[in-house]
Structures are given as structure tokens and as C-alpha cells.
């Protein structure tokens, strides 16, 4: 009886460990990459370019919405506006496909873009983008929902200047007027690879699997002075800002127009410095925890001197420190994961060895003749299950 239970135990141990190992192998694919604990309030579908469903493994079902500026927000799939938005994006995608567009509707659960870069993160969101390519960086952006245009000054600067009618400064925080609260995940870089979207809006031609909505037509002739940037009508996209008081809210990261020194920008940008040195394959585990969100600092217009990087330059955070505490922890990359698995395998082999020795000892104590201890075969020893048995187990030597 005892030897049987021991061998059963051995089998169980082997099975469990192999399961763990396999689970580890598969970990990058099935684990929950985006955890939503807070859902965004309404976002116009005009500003959205994709949606995706989070993985079943996340437990709480959520729709991840991507805006035209590649920021991600969690939304409640049960809300009517979310249903309407998804429907609209589906129709748009279908229309584009019919019109010979290159949109590929990708079915399946989401694996976030491999290079989640620059973007705002908001309360109660845990992201675990699994990077496999370029260095990944996350750029937190302000979450004061209705800061006025503020002429681009950095949101965390408590300038204390109240604006007059023409300046863009913060009215009441958007929480009061129904805007998304504490929900933004991160901004995705314009070009990336391997994302599986459940459904989304028109996909423009290009290297990325994601709709970048870049115009594909040839630039029109223009004055030399206008050659800086051109957009011509043959290619649609959903981007837009808003009116009234220049406000930048939740997911926005205005580029300041003032020439402040970096030290003046407050403590938040320091958080993102960690990202600058992340090598390829780095993963970020970002936990954004809410902090008090009482007020939105006023900002006044300032003259030229751009400080913050463009969306493609994934450094420096611009975020309202009153609303957010961002905990950004680099997670070991793929090599580290491999190392962990190797260690696990060794531990497993060690365990097997110990079990083998234990069994051997046990059987010896049971009085099995030494000669029945078995033969050697490629580093493994065949051990009889019991003294009179002709069934064997393998144990490493």
C-alpha cells in the first residue's frame, strides 16, 4: 500500500510540476495583461479607432478602447454607449473592408501591442504589457479631466495662475461633468506589432497590425512654407479635440509652451526615467493608484519653447500628481523568465532525485534484494515499484 501511494505521489509531483512549467511557458499568452478596476465614463466614438476585449483570465470583463491618439481606456461592455461605440467601429471596419481598405478584423482575445509606449495611466489600472520588441515605455499623462487648454504648460505645474477669458485653463474637473474618470491605461506607439484585436475600426495600410489611420495619399502641392505637414482628404481617421475652455483632461498630455527646467516639472516625470534604459523585451508592470484629486491647477499661456517630447519620444510624464500615484515596476524580461524556468526544471529534477532516493531507501528497508535496484539507462535508473513487482519507475541518477 505504502509503495503505491509513494509512486502515486511521485506521479502527482511530476504532473504538477510539468503543469506549472507548461503554464509558465504559456504565461505570456494567456495571463491577464490589462486589469481594469475602474471603467471610463463616456468617450465619443469619433475619438475611437479600435476596441478589444480583455482576456477571459482577467475575470472582470471589460472593453479596452483605443483613442485616435493611441491611448487605452477600460470601458464597461454593459453600458449602452460602449455597445453603440463597438457597433459603430464594427460598421466602420466593414465599410472600409468593402471599400477595399486593408483593415484586418482580428478575432481573439487581446494580447496588447508589443510595444506599449508613452501614454497616460489612470487610477485603478494594472497593466502588464509583454514586450517582445522595442523598448517599452509608458508615459503617464494628466488626468485632470477638464484642465483648460493652458497653453500647453505641464499639468503637474501648480502655477496658481487664474486665466482670463481667452486663456485655456482648467474649469471644473471632468468628474463633475461626466467625462471619463480615472481610467486611462497607456498610450500605444504609432507603430507596433502583433496585437490581436477582437474588433476595431478601419485599418490603414502600413506595417502595423493596428489602424494607424495615416493618410496614404500623395501630399498635395503646397507652398514651401507649408511643407511641414500635410493631410489630404482621401484618407479618413477619427481624431479630434474639444471646445470651450482649452481643456486637457484625462488622457491628454499637452506639450508645454514654456521653457521651464525639468526640475520644475514636479516629481512625476522622475517615474518615467526608469523606462529610458529598458532594453528590448522589457515588460512593465504598472500599477496606478489613486491619490487625492481635489483640484486642477490653473495654467496660463506662455511663449514658445517646447519642453515635452512628442508622442514618439517616450520619456517624461505629464500627469496630475494630485490625482495619481504611479507605481512603475520593471518586470524581468524574457531571458529572466527563461532563467526562472531553468531553475524550476532543476528544482523539479532535484525533487525527483530526492523522491527516488527516498523510495530506494524505503524499498531497501522493506528488504528488497539489492540486485533488484534496477539498470541504468541514459542517466535514469529503473526502480521496481515493489519487491515482487515487474513494473518500474524512472528516477534520475
Amino acid at each position: 500500500m505504502a509503495p503505491i501511494s509513494l509512486s502515486w505521489l511521485l506521479r502527482l509531483a511530476t504532473f504538477c510540476h510539468l503543469t506549472v512549467l507548461l503554464a509558465g511557458q504559456h504565461h505570456g499568452v494567456t495571463k491577464c495583461n490589462i486589469t481594469c478596476s475602474k471603467m471610463t465614463s463616456k468617450i465619443p466614438v469619433a475619438l475611437l479607432i479600435h476596441y478589444q476585449q480583455n482576456q477571459a483570465s482577467c475575470g472582470k470583463r471589460a472593453i479596452i478602447l483605443e483613442t485616435r491618439q493611441h491611448r487605452l481606456f477600460c470601458a464597461d461592455p454593459k453600458e449602452q454607449w460602449v455597445k453603440d461605440a463597438m457597433q459603430h467601429l464594427d460598421r466602420q471596419a466593414a465599410a472600409l473592408t468593402r471599400n477595399g481598405g486593408t483593415f484586418e478584423k482580428q478575432i481573439g482575445e487581446v494580447k496588447p501591442r508589443t510595444t506599449p509606449a508613452a501614454g497616460g495611466m489612470d487610477e485603478s489600472v494594472v497593466l502588464e504589457p509583454e514586450a517582445t520588441g522595442e523598448s517599452s515605455s509608458l508615459e503617464p499623462t494628466p488626468s485632470s479631466q477638464e484642465a483648460q487648454r493652458a497653453l500647453g504648460t505641464s499639468p503637474e505645474l501648480p502655477t496658481g495662475v487664474t486665466g482670463s477669458s481667452g486663456t485655456r485653463l482648467p474649469p471644473t474637473p471632468k468628474a463633475q461633468d461626466g467625462g471619463p474618470v480615472g481610467t486611462e491605461l497607456f498610450r500605444v506607439p504609432p507603430v507596433s506589432t502583433a496585437a490581436t484585436w477582437q474588433s476595431s475600426a478601419p485599418h490603414q495600410p502600413g506595417p502595423s497590425l493596428w489602424a494607424e489611420a495615416k493618410t496614404s495619399e500623395a501630399p498635395s502641392t503646397q507652398d514651401p512654407s507649408t511643407q511641414a505637414s500635410t493631410a489630404s482628404s482621401p484618407a479618413p481617421e477619427e481624431n479630434a479635440p474639444s471646445e470651450g475652455q482649452r481643456v486637457w483632461g484625462q488622457g491628454q498630455s499637452p506639450r508645454p509652451e514654456n521653457s521651464l527646467e525639468r526640475e520644475e516639472m514636479g516629481p512625476v516625470p522622475a517615474h518615467t526615467d526608469a523606462f529610458q534604459d529598458w532594453g528590448p523585451g522589457s515588460m512593465a508592470h504598472v500599477s496606478v493608484v489613486p491619490v487625492s484629486s481635489e483640484g486642477t491647477p490653473s495654467r496660463e499661456p506662455v511663449a514658445s519653447g517646447s519642453w515635452t517630447p512628442k508622442a514618439e519620444e517616450p520619456i517624461h510624464a505629464t500627469m496630475d500628481p494630485q490625482r495619481l500615484g504611479v507605481l512603475i515596476t520593471p518586470v524581468p524580461d524574457a531571458q529572466a523568465a527563461t532563467r526562472r524556468q531553468a531553475v524550476g526544471l532543476l528544482a523539479f529534477l532535484g525533487l525527483l532525485f530526492c523522491l527516488g532516493v527516498a523510495m530506494f531507501t524505503y524499498q531497501s528497508l522493506q528488504g528488497c534484494p539489492r540486485k533488484m535496484a534496477g539498470e541504468m539507462a541514459e542517466g535514469l535508473r529503473y526502480i521496481p515499484r515493489s519487491c515482487g513487482s515487474n513494473s518500474y519507475v524512472l528516477v534520475p541518477v
Epitope: 471610463t40 465614463s41 463616456k42 468617450i43 465619443p44 466614438v45 469619433a46 475619438l47 483613442t67 485616435r68 491618439q69 481606456f73 449602452q80 454607449w81 453603440d84 459603430h88 479631466q145 477638464e146 483648460q148 487648454r149 497653453l151 500647453g152 481667452g166 486663456t167 485655456r168 471632468k174 461633468d177 461626466g178 467625462g179 494607424e212 495615416k214 493618410t215 511641414a228 505637414s229 500635410t230 493631410a231 489630404s232 484618407a235 479618413p236 481617421e237 477619427e238 481624431n239 479630434a240 479635440p241 474639444s242 471646445e243 470651450g244 475652455q245 482649452r246 481643456v247 486637457w248 483632461g249 484625462q250 488622457g251 491628454q252 499637452p254 506639450r255 509652451e257 499661456p301 517646447s306
Partner: antibody, heavy 122, light 107 residues
Framework: EVQLVQSGAEVKKPGATVKISCKAS????????IHWVQQAPGKGLEWMGW????????KFNERFKGRVTITADKSTNTAYMELSSLRSEDTAVYYC???????????????WGQGTTLTVSS | DIQMTQSPSSLSASVGDRVTITCRAS??????LAWYQQKPGKAPKLLLY???TLSGGVPSRFSGSGSGTDYTLTISSLQPEDFATYYC?????????FGGGTKLEIK
């Protein structure tokens, strides 16, 4: 103070092309979308399209698609709207307007240019 | 495309009157609606937007209400400077569309 100053009135012949400018000041030009809105005489307002200076991702109203080009010169903080193959029904006042790049609020237009009158007549 | 139907197209009222202008969308716009005031020869001016938020510098006599597809702009007590044309605009989906306008005239 945020200001959008548009170029002067234009008179064009059918089939011609017009290019209207909109010079922005008082805010970071590349942060905010520029929208163009048409208002034909005695008619309502019609949104033509948006453009974020420095970003090649415009969006156009299908009605104007293929005839409209929006460009921007970041060095002078000026946006341009070019309308080609003009016809008499393009006679209207054209406004540039902006909205913040808030990724959640949407595009209501808080600042407007003074408007540019375009007359298309043979 | 979402069509915006404004009514009435014109309205005569006196100073001190309470005035209501309605705007109906052909589909749900989830409160992404803005109201503008335009005076002859001038550019439109934003009054209210999303969830009836009053734009900066706009007097509190202007208010908005509604949900789903039906929205209203109310001026609680007309002032001489309020005589103008009013437009609603949906910005839920593109193309953004405006109502046909309501011309508010002095009775």
C-alpha cells in the same frame, strides 16, 4: 489669449483651387486639432474635417473628401485648407476652429477664426 | 451620419422671456452635444457642451438638458444680446453634424 486669424476673402472661378490660411496663437499649435467648418449663405454649418498639425491622420467629411487638403506649417503656427475643383455651391464662409486634444471629451469647438468668405463665380 | 433637427427654425420673443430651443438627433449621441450662438457676420460662439457644461464666460441663464436623442437649450430670461441664431452640434460620431439653426428675433 487664444486666437485664430484667417486669411482674407477670395473670389475664384469654377474649377479653380483656393487655399485659406488660419494662423494660431496663444497655445501650443501642435497639441490641438484644427477643424474646418463651411457655412453657405443662409445655410447652416457643415463640418469639413479635422487635422492635428504634425500628425498625418486627418479625418474628412465624405462630402468634401477628395477635394480637400489640410496642411500646416508648424514654424508659423498656420493651418491651411485647400479646396479644389471649385463649384458655385462652394460659395460660403469657411471657419477654422479648434478643440482640445483631450482624448475623452470630444470635439466641441471652443475657438473659432473670424471666417473667410469664398465666392465662386464665373 | 447622424442628422440633427432643430426646432423651431425661428422664434420671436421679448426681453425677459424664457425661451426653449430643441434639437433632435437621428440616433443616440450619448449627451455629446454642443450649443453655439452666432450673430450676423461673426463666428459661432460655444455656449454649452457635453452633459450641459457651461462654457467659460457664458451667463448662467443659458442651460441645457436632455438625453438619448432629444436635447433642449433654455434661456431663462432673454437679454437684448441674446438675439442671435443658435445651433446644436453632435460630436458623438463623425461626420460631426449641426442642426439647421434657430433664429431668435425680438418680438
Amino acid at each position: 489669449e487664444v486666437q485664430l486669424v484667417q486669411s482674407g476673402a477670395e473670389v475664384k472661378k469654377p474649377g479653380a483651387t483656393v487655399k485659406i490660411s488660419c494662423k494660431a496663437s496663444g497655445y501650443t499649435f501642435t497639441n490641438y486639432y484644427i477643424h474646418w467648418v463651411q457655412q453657405a449663405p443662409g445655410k447652416g454649418l457643415e463640418w469639413m474635417g479635422w487635422y492635428l498639425p504634425g500628425d498625418d491622420s486627418p479625418k474628412f467629411n465624405e462630402r468634401f473628401k477628395g477635394r480637400v487638403t489640410i496642411t500646416a506649417d508648424k514654424s508659423t503656427n498656420t493651418a491651411y485648407m485647400e479646396l479644389s475643383s471649385l463649384r458655385s455651391e462652394d460659395t460660403a464662409v469657411y471657419y477654422c476652429a479648434t478643440s482640445p486634444t483631450d482624448e475623452t471629451q470630444g470635439d466641441y469647438f471652443d475657438y473659432w477664426g473670424q471666417g473667410t468668405t469664398l465666392t465662386v463665380s464665373s | 451620419d447622424i442628422q440633427m433637427t432643430q426646432s423651431p427654425s425661428s422664434l420671436s420673443a421679448s426681453v425677459g422671456d424664457r425661451v426653449t430651443i430643441t434639437c433632435r438627433a437621428s440616433g443616440r449621441i450619448h449627451d455629446f452635444l454642443a450649443w453655439y450662438q452666432q450673430k450676423p457676420g461673426k463666428a459661432p460662439k460655444l455656449l454649452l457642451y457635453t452633459d450641459n457644461t457651461l462654457s467659460g464666460g457664458v451667463p448662467s441663464r443659458f442651460s441645457g438638458s436632455g438625453s438619448g436623442t432629444d436635447y433642449t437649450l433654455t434661456i431663462s430670461s432673454l437679454q437684448p444680446e441674446d438675439f442671435a441664431t443658435y445651433y446644436c452640434q453632435q460630436f458623438w460620431s463623425t461626420p460631426y453634424t449641426f442642426g439647421g439653426g434657430t433664429k431668435l428675433e425680438i418680438k
